[in-house]
């Protein structure tokens, strides 16, 4: 029986041209996470994170994207076209798959303040 | 230039192990995984597992977990696969292969080593 | 684990011809597929990657796209050199599995 949650970052902002670190966390289980995929709202590929082989980063966002911290990611020079769903996909053992949602709102504004709150969608 | 050096060929018999090498060259060992790959012949390609050779973590394909034992020797750049309790089964081609930068995607291939299992 | 199909295991061509090679997965893999090219004797070669990155020094009749779990790989005009079986492969989770393979003949 799957016991765990997800909890992300949920909603949140950030300017043009900045940077927004892209967070899930497992919480309640004791299940062994072996990997955790982060794709893009059309499910194109960010990053994977494997457990023993470390780090995929997708071709396209290899300028600007930084893995970690953890298990997260951060996405760099950020575009208006970032502006989207971000999924975390968690693979453990013996438990099964994850799966979380952030928002990003990518904001023209220079006075665009960077929210962040964890939250369980 | 990146090139991953095989022995060509090692004929083994049956119930026996061989440890089969990889030596790398033209790059930072530590920098890229290593992975194995199986071809038996004239059949097609089979992930066996892979290894971090920075902490020399692994990870495998579940069919090769009690098969293939996975190593690095960080000071002389080589990886090694040792094959246990062969049988005719484990007769093919064993390719080790390295990475993409931040890919695992197979980029560098050996040239592959024939193995044998005859009595 | 993740079931790779390349549901044809041969394909007859001719030179000058425009040639693709389906691959479906059992499950969603994303982008995480890549294409490998191999000649008789040979070690195979990476071709296409994520899925529709030509790698370094390989020529742009070969190219690659799809997502999700149908993938496609097309040569826009087939060379001698290119008689060889190409595989698919998925890295979107362990283990890693590829295709079983299509061999392209020439006419």
């Known amino acids: 029986m799957m016991t765990g949650t997800i909890e992300t970052t949920g909603n949140i902002s950030a300017k043009k041209g900045g940077s927004v670190i892209l967070q899930c966390h497992l919480s309640s289980t004791m299940a062994q996470v072996t990997q955790v995929n982060w794709e893009q709202h059309d499910h194109s590929l960010l990053a994977i994170r494997n457990a023993e082989l470390g780090w995929h980063i997708y071709p396209a966002f290899k300028d600007r994207v930084a893995p970690g911290p953890g298990l997260g990611l951060t996405l760099q020079s950020l575009t208006m076209n970032d502006t989207g769903e971000y999924f975390c996909t968690y693979h453990t053992y013996p438990d099964g798959t994850y799966r979380g949602r952030i928002f990003l709102e990518v904001l023209e504004s220079s006075v665009a303040e960077h929210s962040a709150r964890f939250q369980i969608p | 230039q990146v090139q991953l050096q095989q022995p060509g060929a090692e004929l083994v018999k049956p119930g026996a192990s061989v440890k089969l090498s990889c030596k790398a060259s033209?790059?930072?060992?530590?920098?890229?995984?290593i992975y194995w790959v199986k071809q038996r012949p004239g059949q097609g390609l089979e992930w066996i597992g892979g290894?971090?050779?920075?902490?020399?973590?692994?990870n495998f394909n579940e069919n090769f977990k009690s098969k293939a034992t996975l190593t690095v020797d960080k000071s002389s750049s080589t990886a090694y696969m040792q094959l246990s309790s062969l049988t005719s089964d484990d007769s093919a081609v064993y390719f080790c292969?390295?990475?993409?930068?931040?890919?695992?995607?197979?980029?560098?291939w050996g040239q592959g080593t024939l193995v044998t299992v005859s009595a | 684990d993740i079931v790779m199909t390349q549901s044809h295991k041969f394909m007859s061509t001719s030179v000058g011809d425009r040639v693709s090679i389906t691959c479906k997965a059992s499950?969603?893999?994303?982008?995480?597929v890549a294409w490998y090219q191999q000649k008789p004797g040979q070690s195979p070669k990476l071709l296409i990657y994520?899925?529709?990155y030509r790698y370094t020094g390989v020529p742009d009749r070969f190219t690659g796209s799809g997502s999700g779990t149908d993938f496609t790989f097309t040569i826009s005009s087939v060379q001698a050199e290119d008689l060889a079986v190409y595989y698919c492969?998925?890295?979107?989770?362990?283990?890693?599995?590829f295709g079983g393979g299509t061999k392209l003949e020439i006419k």
């Open positions: 292969t390295r990475g993409n930068y931040y890919g695992y995607e197979f980029a560098y």
């Open positions: 033209g790059y930072t060992f530590i920098s890229y995984n």
């Open positions: 290894v971090n050779p920075s902490n020399g973590n692994t």
């Open positions: 499950q969603h893999v994303s982008t995480a």
């Open positions: 994520s899925p529709s």
């Open positions: 492969q998925q890295h979107y989770s362990t283990p890693w599995t």
